[in-house]
C-alpha cells in the first residue's frame, strides 16, 4: 500500500494505491483511492507512467479528457466514472501488454488540494493449473497443466503423506511456447503416485503463485486449485 500526500500550497489530500499485476491479453485494474470531494466537477484524476511523455488517462469535469493521452494507451483506459465521487480513481486497462509494466502515478486534484501516490504494476501471464490422472501412462501418473504463464515459472510437486519429500527425480516439466510467442503452456508429469494421497502441483513466477491439488482414493478423485498474485503492496 502506498499512501501519498499532496505537497505545499493549498491543502494536501491523501491518495492511496495498491501494487498489482496484469495478465497479458486480459483487462487489468490499477487501484487508487482518494479523499472524496462533494462536487464531481471539482475532481481531476490523472494517471501518469514513468518513461512515457503523454498521460495514461485524464478525467476532469465529470468526464474523460483524452486529448493529451499517450498513444500507447489510446482506446485502452477507463475510470469507473460513477465511483469517482466516492473517491475511487482506479484505472481499468484493457488488453494488458507486457510493456505496460512499470511505475504509475495516480495524481488527484480536488477543491481541497492535490495529492499523488505511485504504484508498481507488473505484467505477465498466469493461469490456474488442472491436475488429472494420466490413464495413458504405464504407471500411476499425474499430469498438471496450466495454459498460460510468463515469465517461465518454477514447478514443484508436494504430497500430504510425504511432506518435505523432493519429487524432482520423479517428475518431468516442460514449457511449450503458445502461438503468440510470449506465453507458455506448462505441463508437469509426476510418476509413481500412490493412492489415498493428496498431491499438489505448485507453479510460481515473480507475479503469481498457483496451486492445483488432487486427492486420489479408490472410490473418487477430488480436485481443487487456487491462484494468488504476489507482491500486492499498498502505497
Amino acid at each position: 500500500l502506498i499512501i501519498g500526500f499532496g505537497i505545499s500550497g493549498r491543502h494536501s489530500i491523501t491518495v492511496t494505491t495498491v501494487a498489482s499485476a496484469g495478465n497479458i491479453g486480459e483487462d487489468g485494474i490499477l487501484s487508487c483511492t482518494f479523499e472524496p470531494d462533494i462536487k464531481l466537477s471539482d475532481i481531476v484524476i490523472q494517471w501518469l507512467k514513468e518513461g512515457v511523455l503523454g498521460l495514461v488517462h485524464e478525467f476532469k469535469e465529470g468526464k474523460d479528457e483524452l486529448s493529451e493521452q499517450d498513444e500507447m494507451f489510446r482506446g485502452r483506459t477507463a475510470v469507473f466514472a460513477d465511483q469517482v465521487i466516492v473517491g475511487n480513481a482506479s484505472l481499468r486497462l484493457k488488453n494488458v501488454q507486457l510493456t505496460d509494466a512499470g511505475t504509475y502515478k495516480c495524481y488527484i486534484i480536488t477543491s481541497k488540494g492535490k495529492g499523488n501516490a505511485n504504484l508498481e504494476y507488473k505484467t505477465g501471464a498466469f493461469s490456474m493449473p488442472e491436475v488429472n490422472v494420466d490413464y495413458n501412462a504405464s504407471s500411476e501418473t499425474l499430469r498438471c497443466e496450466a495454459p498460460r504463464w510468463f515469465p517461465q515459472p518454477t514447478v514443484v510437486w508436494a504430497s500430504q503423506v510425504d511432506q518435505g519429500a523432493n519429487f524432482s527425480e520423479v517428475s518431468n516439466t516442460s514449457f511449450e511456447l503458445n502461438s503468440e510467442n510470449v506465453t507458455m503452456k506448462v505441463v508437469s508429469v509426476l510418476y509413481n503416485v500412490t493412492i489415498n494421497n493428496t498431491y499438489s502441483c505448485m507453479i510460481e513466477n515473480d507475479i503469481a503463485k498457483a496451486t492445483g491439488d488432487i486427492k486420489v482414493t479408490e472410490s473418487e478423485i477430488k480436485r481443487r486449485s487456487h491462484l494468488q498474485l504476489l507482491n500486492s503492496k499498498a502505497s
Epitope: 505537497i7 505545499s8 500550497g9 493549498r10 490523472q46 501518469l48 507512467k49 514513468e50 518513461g51 512515457v52 511523455l53 503523454g54 498521460l55 485524464e58 493529451e68 511505475t103 502515478k105 495524481y107 486534484i109 492535490k114 505511485n118
Partner: antibody
Framework: EIQLQQSGPELVMPGASVKVSCTAS????????MYWVKQSHGKSLEWIAY????????SYNQKFKGKATLTVDKSSSTAYMHLNSLTSEDSAVYYC????????????????WGAGTTVTVSS | DVVMTQTPLSLPVSLGDQASISCRSS???????????LHWYLQKPGQSPKLLIY???NRFSGVPDRFSGSGSGTDFTLKISRVEAEDLGVYFC?????????FGAGTKLELK
C-alpha cells in the same frame, strides 16, 4: 504534441534585467514541475531552479538565489524566469525543461526541453 | 555539490562501432529510498538536450535499444552498441539524488 516554446534571443546591457518565457502545450501544465537550466557557451549544463506551476512553489540552486526569480501564469500555461543585475557571466543559453515522472522530489530528469533562449550581456 | 566526471571528453568513432562513455560521481548516488538518480542526455549540434536514459538503465520512450545504461554507486556507463550518424553529439550524465542537481562536463561523440 508536447512542446515548450521559449521567447526569442535577448541582447541586454550590463546591470539590466531580462524576463525569459516558456509556454507549454500538449500536456496539463500544473501537473509537472518546470525547471530552468543554464548552458554557457560551449560549456556544460547548470540547474538554476524549478517551480511547481500548481501552487507557485519554488526551489533554487543556492548559486542562483538572488539572480533568478521564477513565476508562472497558469491561465496561459507559461513559466517565466527573471534574471537581474546581469553581467557577462550571465551570457548563456537558458532552457526551460519539464520534469519527468517523479517519485517524491528526486527523479529530476527532464523529458521535454524548450529550444533555449540566448541571452547576451554586452555594452 | 556532487561533481560528475565524464571520460573521455572526446570520443572519435566510426559508424557501426560500439561506444562507451563513463561517468563517475564524487559521492554515492544511491538515495535512501533505494533508487539511484543518474540520467543520460544527448545534445546534438544546435539543439536542446534530449533524455536518453533515466535512473541508470531505463530507456526513455522512443530511444533505440542500441542505447543502454549500467552502473551503481559512483560508477556509471552509457553504451551504444552500433553507432549511427544520428547518435553524434555531446552526451551528458546528470545526478538528481543530491541537491543541487548537477551535470557532467559532456562527452563529444564524433566521427574519426
Amino acid at each position: 504534441e508536447i512542446q515548450l516554446q521559449q521567447s526569442g534571443p535577448e541582447l541586454v546591457m550590463p546591470g539590466a534585467s531580462v524576463k525569459v518565457s516558456c509556454t507549454a502545450s500538449g500536456y496539463p501544465f500544473t501537473t509537472y514541475n518546470m525547471y530552468w537550466v543554464k548552458q554557457s557557451h560551449g560549456k556544460s549544463l547548470e540547474w538554476i531552479a524549478y517551480i511547481d506551476p500548481y501552487n507557485g512553489g519554488t526551489s533554487y540552486n543556492q548559486k542562483f538565489k538572488g539572480k533568478a526569480t521564477l513565476t508562472v501564469d497558469k491561465s496561459s500555461s507559461t513559466a517565466y524566469m527573471h534574471l537581474n543585475s546581469l553581467t557577462s557571466e550571465d551570457s548563456a543559453v537558458y532552457y526551460c525543461a519539464r520534469s519527468g515522472f517523479y517519485d517524491g522530489y528526486y527523479a529530476w530528469y527532464f523529458d521535454v526541453w524548450g529550444a533555449g533562449t540566448t541571452v547576451t550581456v554586452s555594452s | 555539490d556532487v561533481v560528475m566526471t565524464q571520460t573521455p571528453l572526446s570520443l572519435p568513432v566510426s559508424l557501426g562501432d560500439q561506444a562507451s562513455i563513463s561517468c563517475r560521481s564524487s559521492q554515492s548516488l544511491v538515495h535512501s529510498g533505494g533508487n539511484t538518480y543518474l540520467h543520460w542526455y544527448l545534445q546534438k549540434p544546435g539543439q536542446s538536450p534530449k533524455l536518453l536514459i533515466y535512473k541508470v538503465s531505463n530507456r526513455f520512450s522512443g530511444v533505440p535499444d542500441r542505447f543502454s545504461g549500467s552502473g551503481s554507486g559512483t560508477d556509471f556507463t552509457l553504451k551504444i552498441s552500433r553507432v549511427e550518424a544520428e547518435d553524434l553529439g555531446v552526451y551528458f550524465c546528470s545526478q538528481s539524488t543530491h541537491v543541487p542537481l548537477t551535470f557532467g562536463a559532456g562527452t563529444k561523440l564524433e566521427l574519426k
